[in-house]
């Protein structure tokens, strides 16, 4: 015996591969104080949840660690957080509040998640002019990456002498000391999203001035 409620907002959400999306969900205001249950997000047609706060329930291997139920009954929050989105996450999902002690549960309407190809590319920023024999810091950044996702792997490729500087979840610094012969050569920053198995890169030509 189920009681239905409507998810607020759009009927579908779009996310790019490797990135994050929040599927909004609010518990029904008709939920009585006496209903203490666990929350479960399901892929349409599946019996095993993709995310839950039930300590005794297994979740699908495919979504473990990437899908999280953001459970806060005080604020009526039952949203689903998806990180490291993969193509096979492309599906319809619904939320269910259930207690084995109670006859009825609460089931939400369905919401479709559409996973698109990653179109964002890394940015490479160069502070001013590159001077031969002088070290400069180049930054490769992916500001569109969400903090809670698996940190991307940055790789730099250049013929010029380089050393790696500090990195964050969203950026990597490369210290380059160019030589005259490095003028017009390529420098590439490659960013791999291990959670989704997607790689993006940006290549620039070095413009080296002589001291």
């Amino acid at each position: 015996q189920e009681r239905r409620f409507q998810l607020e907002g759009p009927e579908s959400l779009t996310v790019q591969e490797g990135l994050c999306v929040l599927v909004p969900c609010r518990l029904p205001t008709t939920l009585p104080a006496s209903y203490y249950g666990y929350g479960y997000w399901f892929l349409e047609g599946a019996d095993v949840p993709v995310a839950t706060n039930d300590p005794d329930e297994e979740v699908q291997e495919e979504t473990r660690g990437r899908f999280h139920l953001l459970w806060d009954p005080r604020r009526k929050n039952c949203s689903l957080s998806i990180r490291d989105a993969r193509r096979r996450d492309n599906a319809a999902y619904f939320f269910r509040l259930k207690s084995k002690w109670m006859k009825y549960g609460y089931t939400s309407s369905k919401l479709s998640v559409r996973v698109m190809a990653l179109t964002h590319r890394p940015n490479i920023s160069i502070p001013g002019t590159l001077e031969s024999g002088h070290p400069s810091n180049l930054t490769c950044s992916v500001p569109w990456v969400c903090e809670q996702g698996t940190p991307p792997i940055f790789s730099w490729m250049s013929a010029a002498p380089t050393s790696l500087g500090p990195r964050t979840t969203q950026s990597s610094v490369l210290t380059i000391t160019p030589r005259p012969q490095d003028h017009s050569t390529n420098l590439t920053c490659q960013v791999t999203f291990p959670g989704a198995g997607v790689t993006m890169e940006r290549t620039i030509q070095l413009n080296v001035s002589y001291a």
């Epitope: 009585p32 104080a33 203490y36 300590p55 002690w101 006859k103």
Partner: antibody, heavy 114, light 107 residues
Framework: EVQLVESGGGLVQPGRSLRLSCAAS????????MHWVRQAPGKGLEWVAV????????YYADSVKGRFTISRDNSKNTLYLQMNSLRAEDTAVYYC???????WGKGTTVTVSS | AIRLTQSPSSLSASVGDRVTITCRAS??????LNWYQQKPGKAPKLLIY???SLQSGVPSRFSGSGSGTDFTLTISSLQPEDFATYYC?????????FGPGTKVDIK
Amino acid sequence: EVQLVESGGGLVQPGRSLRLSCAASGFTFSSYGMHWVRQAPGKGLEWVAVISYDGSNKYYADSVKGRFTISRDNSKNTLYLQMNSLRAEDTAVYYCANYGMDVWGKGTTVTVSS
Amino acid sequence: AIRLTQSPSSLSASVGDRVTITCRASQSISSYLNWYQQKPGKAPKLLIYAASSLQSGVPSRFSGSGSGTDFTLTISSLQPEDFATYYCQQSYGTPFTFGPGTKVDIK
């Protein structure tokens, strides 16, 4: 009006049995899990047992496991607690409550003494 | 089993005082914590459910807060009818344990 009324308490000798009842009214009893909670004289509240809406799931406190049995008859809107092998430490006021514990009965007193 | 501890075990206060009672769980119970008031010879009464939601009909001077393992019940301005024993209880999982109680009496 939502109401729970316990009955069946009394004085019983150690080792004997007693069955408590809890009559429910004013709500759809068959949709709710139910609890038994007890309170020894001058002591705090102790959760005893819970039963699901259809009786298929039951769980007991370690202190009563194997001796007490929780059951229900949805056709009679009644919750039961069968207490066997009673001990002096089972002396308490026994309350029934709905699953959310927002509705309680007034309690029935069980005294285990020789 | 999840153990709940309450502090203080008893306190003396005056009408109008702000009273704070804490409840600590032996493991994280998210926000599955409830608070009850019990007066001598009476059944317990639900005050707060899901750590901070005020039960219907309960005066707004009662409030709850906390999540995980540490929770607080606050009475903003103690009234004569508030002198009672207060219990926390977790509904995270079986067994559904209660705290030992905090008795609030008149100073």
